[in-house]
Interface confidence: low
């Protein structure tokens, strides 16, 4: 009977290991063998691995490489979801202290309007957030409607509110004289333009936001393919089919083997960094009528003001709408009676402002600023990975698939392996489907960032005027662009302290006849829309 | 291994104040919403404030409405109830809570502290 | 408020017998409902959430079921240690609020 092998030749150390990845032993030899059932640890002499345990391996391997793309983009993606849903929130809340102002607006400057107001007010509203969140609402058919809407309950209830019963059933004549008429001049025009701008940008970027996420979802649970399981195996594991269980990859070696894997993923880099590039120039125009927070919570001035301007002119449309709607069949003539001398006030619109301490656009910037530290984020990736996972500094003593080295060559790394996979057949293949998708989505978001971004696009154009909105805005007739101070009204000031104070607590229209006053107010608000929960929101 | 100290509950005055603290450790702090909810004498269980991972958002039920305030400082891992203007109803065992991180079920729950208000 | 009835404060039962707690929500609050066990001196722990997924670390005697509004805890057999109360939430609005719980005796 022969002696017993001496300790170094047991795969005692090997057992012990593997037995961590796998619980149970019967799939280590005891003793080394030939392994001629091996396919990726071709050995060199004895090893102590089976053909089981290297496709143990195989797993383990791709499974870890999942895991490290996914520790690698965890801070981009908390980054980019974290603010996608603190932008739709806010969102969200910018609309709902719209929609109260507006409401408050009615309640205490024309009561006799509510309820029939709030309900029009809370439909155009709804309308708002639904159009953010990618609803394919036309933004001047929601103007029109909400003005079209007002115009039958303001010309009953403000300039003609001795009307009998009988002459109540003119509600459509009136819709179609109020644009006929221009009935609010060009409010509902100048409304159109700096909600659409605003929305248009607003929404935009909250695609953006989430097709981020979908980019870093896609990339974070990409499957590795066998090619680049074995791959990572070799340069993994199969050191320790040797018994040599301290030893650490090479960084070139890594660096290779990363880049092969990652070759498809690679590939989105450059959309990758033009979607932030672009994603910045949309948020350097978010500002005035291209800033949502500051053009939806001016509105209820604005709404204010286009009322005044009908009371103004109350005495003659009140006679041509009298003429014009006294029987439902003269609606075609409507054109004949319009009013050439309606009176005009030279007020001029003040969109909104707020106060810049925490508003959303800082917050904006800020995320910006953050996501441009991420821009050689995906040409970083395979560095990222050899530096976060085990490797030998300066390639002193080290694995390099094969055997121990002194110095990583990729050559003699090459020719050593002509039995073996091939590391270069990894970079010839194209990219996955799945990331050929993701790349489509990212060139087309790029696409309609930089139509929003281009100044010739004239969607964020930066030469505003003083007042906050492009000359010509307004039409030919400068002297319909008004506004004013809203007289009686409320200052906004300070809107939102964004993420201090939330949701309006009152909603008006919910409660038309609560004693609270709906007015803005510049005090801490206290509503918690939805923790997290995706069942229902806040009511 | 995820743990919730309150502290700072007591005897108080009707009409006094109080703030709770509720130390957080074991976990990324900053990734959860937290809540306090409070165990009234008859064993009720009642929602009294929630705040989001980054505390710029806060839920307030009507009972406390405006005498109550959560906070958070994530550089601290801690959460705070400031209550003020106490009522004998607020007499109750108060819980630090945080939520599950894909729900809003309540997922861990501190020991809690007690605060009892007296005439 | 959604209200949560818990209708049955007290049940009496025995050692590896099956337990039904049900809990029924005044409106639809879909499957966002979560089940809690309290011990005496200790605080509610979570067993269940959306009405039917179970928490990790525990037992699978626990079972939760329902949507809508009536929503069912099951203990499949009843060990001692589960001799205590069990309090129901919804969670689909605010305020979030739960059920005056259901106190588990024995026979």
């Known amino acids: 009977q022969p002696p017993p092998p001496p300790p170094d030749a047991t795969c005692h150390q090997v057992r012990s290991f593997f037995q961590r990845l796998q619980p149970g032993l019967k799939w280590v030899p005891e003793t080394p063998v030939p392994g001629s059932d091996l396919q990726v640890c071709l050995p060199k002499g004895p090893t102590c691995c089976s053909r089981k345990m290297e496709e143990k391996y195989q797993l383990t391997a791709r499974l870890n490489m999942e895991q490290l793309l996914q520790s690698a983009s965890m801070e981009l993606k908390f980054l980019i979801i974290q603010n996608a849903a603190v932008f739709q929130e806010a969102f969200e809340i910018v609309v709902r202290h719209a929609k109260n102002y507006t409401n408050a607006m009615f309640k205490n400057n024309y009561p006799s309007l509510t309820p029939q107001a709030f309900e029009f007010v809370g439909e155009f509203f709804t309308d708002v957030s639904l159009y953010i969140l990618g609803s394919d609402i036309n933004v001047d058919d929601m103007v029109n409607e909400l003005f079209d809407s007002l115009f039958p309950v303001i010309y009953t209830q403000l300039m003609n509110p001795g009307l009998p019963d009988s002459a109540l059933d003119i509600n459509e004549c009136l819709r179609g004289a109020r644009r006929d008429l221009k009935v609010f001049g060009n409010f509902p025009k100048l409304i159109m333009t700096q909600v659409s701008k605003s929305l248009q940008v607003t929404r935009i970027f909250l695609q953006a936001l989430n097709l981020g996420i979908e980019v870093i979802n896609t990339t974070d649970h990409l499957k590795f393919s066998k090619d680049c399981g074995r791959m990572l195996t070799r340069m993994w594991y199969c050191s320790y089919c040797q018994g040599l269980m301290m030893v650490k990859p090479c960084g070139g070696y890594c660096n290779v083997v990363m880049q092969g894997c990652m070759a498809g993923v690679v590939e989105i880099d450059k959309y990758w960094r033009e979607y932030i590039l672009s994603l910045e120039e949309l948020v350097n125009g978010m500002y005035r009528i291209y800033d949502m927070e500051n053009v939806l919570l001016g509105l209820f001035s604005t709404i204010h003001d286009s009322i005044q301007y009908v009371q103004k002119n109350a005495g003659k449309l009140t006679t041509t709408i009298g003429k014009l709607c006294a029987h439902s069949q003269q609606r075609q003539y409507r054109s004949a009676y319009y009013p050439e001398d309606l009176f005009i006030d030279k007020k001029v619109l003040k969109v909104a402002h707020v106060e810049h301490e925490e508003t959303l656009s800082s917050r904006r910037r800020e995320l910006i600023q953050k996501l441009k530290s991420f821009i050689s984020f995906y040409s970083a990736l395979p560095g990222y990975i050899c530096s976060h996972s085990p490797v030998a500094e300066n390639d002193t003593l080290c694995w390099n698939g094969q055997e121990l080295v002194e110095r990583y060559s990729q050559k003699a790394a090459r020719n050593g392996m002509k039995n073996q996979f091939n590391l270069h057949e990894l970079k010839m293949k194209g990219p996955e489907p799945v990331v050929s998708q993701i790349i489509d989505k990212l060139k087309h978001i790029n696409q309609l960032l930089r139509t929003m971004s281009m100044p010739k696009g004239r969607v964020l154009d930066k030469n505003l005027d003083e007042e906050g909105f492009e000359s010509g805005d307004c039409g030919d007739d400068e002297d319909e662009c008004i506004g004013g101070s809203g007289d009686g009204m409320i200052k906004v000031k300070n809107q939102l302290r964004f993420l201090a104070e939330l949701a309006y607590d009152l909603d008006v229209d919910d409660a038309p006849g609560n004693s609270q006053q709906a007015t803005p107010k510049d005090n801490e608000i206290s509503t918690f829309h939805n923790l997290g929960n995706v069942h229902s929101p806040l009511k | 291994d995820v743990k919730l100290v309150e502290s700072g509950g007591g005897l108080v005055k009707l009409g006094g104040s109080l703030k709770l603290s509720c130390a957080a450790s074991?976990?990324?702090?900053?990734?959860?919403?937290m809540s306090w909810v409070r165990q009234t004498p008859e064993k009720r269980l009642d929602l009294v404030a929630a705040?989001?991972?980054?505390?710029?958002?806060?839920y307030y039920p009507d009972t406390v409405k405006g005498r109550f305030t959560i906070s958070r400082d994530n550089a601290k891992n801690t959460l705070y109830l400031q209550m003020n203007s106490l009522k004998s109803e607020d007499t109750a065992l108060y819980y630090c809570?945080?939520?599950?991180?894909?729900?809003?079920?309540?997922?861990?729950w501190g020991q809690g502290t007690s605060v009892t208000v007296s005439s | 408020d959604i209200v949560m009835t818990q209708s049955q404060k007290f049940m009496s039962t025995s050692i590896r017998d099956r337990v039904n707690i049900t809990c029924k929500a005044s409106?639809?609050?879909?499957?966002?409902v979560a089940w809690y066990q309290q011990r005496p001196g200790q605080s509610p722990k979570l067993l269940i959430y959306?009405?039917?997924n179970r928490y990790s670390g525990v037992p699978d005697r626990f079972t939760g079921s329902g949507s809508g509004t009536d929503f069912t805890l099951t203990i499949s057999n009843m060990q001692s240690e589960d001799l205590t109360s069990y309090f129901c939430?919804?969670?689909?609005?605010?305020?979030?609020?739960f059920g005056v719980g259901t106190k588990l005796e024995l026979k």
């Open positions: 809570v945080r939520h599950y991180r894909y729900d809003n079920a309540m997922d861990y």
């Open positions: 074991g976990f990324t702090f900053s990734s959860y919403y």
């Open positions: 705040i989001n991972f980054y505390g710029g958002l806060a």
């Open positions: 409106q639809n609050v879909g499957t966002a």
């Open positions: 959306s009405a039917s």
């Open positions: 939430q919804q969670y689909s609005s605010y305020p979030l609020t």
